[in-house]
């Protein structure tokens, strides 16, 4: 997260750290007890090393109560999704076991309605992903509060010309942004998840090249599919 | 503590511009959104629109527009609307209002200035 | 956009009573609503965020309920300095409304 600030501990408890032997890889988000959305193009960077999930976390390095390592039994990418697009980016991870719920980890609820967040809604990302362009990764959860921006100026040919489809959403990125190792967190709008970070290989911080994020409506109907 | 301190009620003439402004005290100026609401007399409130000092990033209500244009300067954290091309609807108490943020994506009004009137009159 | 049907538009009612404010949204925000009170010639101060989350300070004779499209205010054993004007305002998009307000008055 560039230019965002460090979450409050556990206030978010349904923030997931999907990791590949043991190191942060991409975000991740619980929406039910025994299953993690995510970013489909985050499973290409595991190559195949060993994936896990890590609820209940704030920092990633040190010892806290409530975090636990989770093995993954099942991952589902959607059947859609190119390495070469960020078309239908989302993946599920089965959890090995249901996650034991408290304060610290808990499902958030997603939305289901198919209609686009207005612009100028205020939303919030969160992750452990690079805090600068250097490159510098963050130990404890970081978050920030971005606009919603309108899919026709996100098309913009200065911004991503064309490129957004109604599957898509687009929040503002003007030196505040999701960025590499947030891909697969979730854009919460007011207390309900509406994105998911896609993984390509924008550049971040960039007025002109808003983040993209997937469409968690658009997509219900797999979700309910694969989580049945 | 927080406070946002507003300037002082204004008389101005129809067709003209006005700025007010609004001064932060208490908190990081830049890491908080500052809205714009107005309020005509006995009248509900109204929702202008917001501003990001950290980044000016501003967004209005589209009613607003053309009407109302929010900048900040951070160097004394201060936020700023300019009226123009007032009449008399324009005629309202003017309040500046920080977004506090709650839990992971909740927000409100949590402090608000103490008003500026603006009356249009020739 | 959204719009905030609040009822009723003025009440008068005696200190010691207990009163409910309620505010209809056109769709469902979700819980994300705030409720304001506001005094003659001063800004208004924010009494609940989210619903149901009392702010700092807010006595706890005040209380938010209420989802979907439905929320309510409620004012347990009122107290003198609770007279005024009482605003909701929904979060849910842009733009922000508000409800047109209730006017509390004493009886």
């Known amino acids: 997260i560039l230019g965002g600030r460090e979450a409050e501990a556990h206030a978010r408890p349904y923030m997931a750290s999907v990791q590949v032997n043991g190191e942060h890889l991409c975000g991740g988000v619980l929406v039910a007890e025994q299953w993690v959305l995510s970013a489909a193009h985050c499973l290409e960077d595991a190559a195949d090393g060993k994936v896990q999930v890590l609820l209940g976390a704030h920092s990633l390095s040190q010892p806290e109560p409530s975090k636990r390592l989770y093995d993954v039994l099942r991952a589902v990418p959607h059947p859609d999704s190119r390495p070469d697009t960020i078309d239908h980016d989302l993946l599920l991870l089965q959890l090995s076991e249901k996650a034991t719920l408290g304060p610290a980890v808990r499902p958030l609820p997603w939305q289901r309605v198919d209609r686009d967040v207005e612009p100028g809604t205020l939303c919030d990302v969160a992750g452990w992903g690079i805090v600068s362009h250097a490159g510098r990764r963050p130990d404890r959860l970081q978050h920030v509060l971005l606009p919603v921006l309108d899919r026709a100026t996100c098309n913009r040919r200065t911004h991503h010309d064309g490129a957004i489809t109604q599957r898509m959403m687009c929040a503002e990125s003007n030196r505040r942004d999701s960025c590499k190792g947030d891909s697969g967190g979730p854009l919460v709008c007011g207390g309900v998840l509406e994105g998911v970070v896609t993984s390509g290989s924008r550049v971040c911080g960039n007025r002109k090249k808003p983040g993209i994020y997937t469409r968690v409506a658009s997509y219900a109907a797999w979700i309910d599919s694969v989580l049945a | 503590q927080v406070h946002l301190q507003q300037s002082g009620p204004e008389l101005v003439k129809p067709g003209a511009s006005v700025k007010i402004s609004c001064k932060a005290s208490?908190?990081?100026?830049?890491?908080?959104?500052i809205n714009w609401v107005k309020q005509r007399p006995g009248q509900g409130l109204e929702w202008i629109g917001w501003?990001?000092?950290?980044?000016?990033?501003?967004y209005y209500n589209e009613k607003f527009k053309g009407k109302a244009t929010l900048t900040v300067d951070k160097s004394s954290s201060t936020a700023y609307m300019l009226l123009s091309s007032l009449t008399s609807e324009d005629s309202a108490v003017y309040f500046c209002a920080r977004y506090g943020y709650y839990g992971s994506s909740f927000y409100a009004m949590d402090y608000w200035g103490q008003g500026t009137s603006v009356t249009v009159s020739s | 956009d959204i719009q905030m049907t609040q009822s009723p538009a003025s009440l008068s009612v005696s200190v010691g009573e207990t009163v409910t404010i309620t505010c209809r949204a056109s769709?469902?925000?979700?819980?994300?609503l705030a409720w304001y009170q506001q005094k003659q010639g001063k800004s208004p101060q924010l009494l609940v965020y989210a619903a149901t989350n009392l702010a700092d300070g807010v006595p706890s004779r005040f209380s938010g309920s209420g989802s979907g499209t439905q929320y309510s205010l409620k004012i347990n054993s009122l107290q003198s300095e609770d007279f005024g004007s009482y605003y909701c305002q929904h979060f849910w998009g842009t733009p922000p409304t508000f409800g047109g307000g209730s006017k509390l008055e004493i009886k």
């Open positions: 208490g908190y990081t100026f830049i890491d908080y959104y």
């Open positions: 769709e469902n925000i979700y819980s994300n």
């Open positions: 501003i990001f000092p950290g980044s000016d990033s501003t």
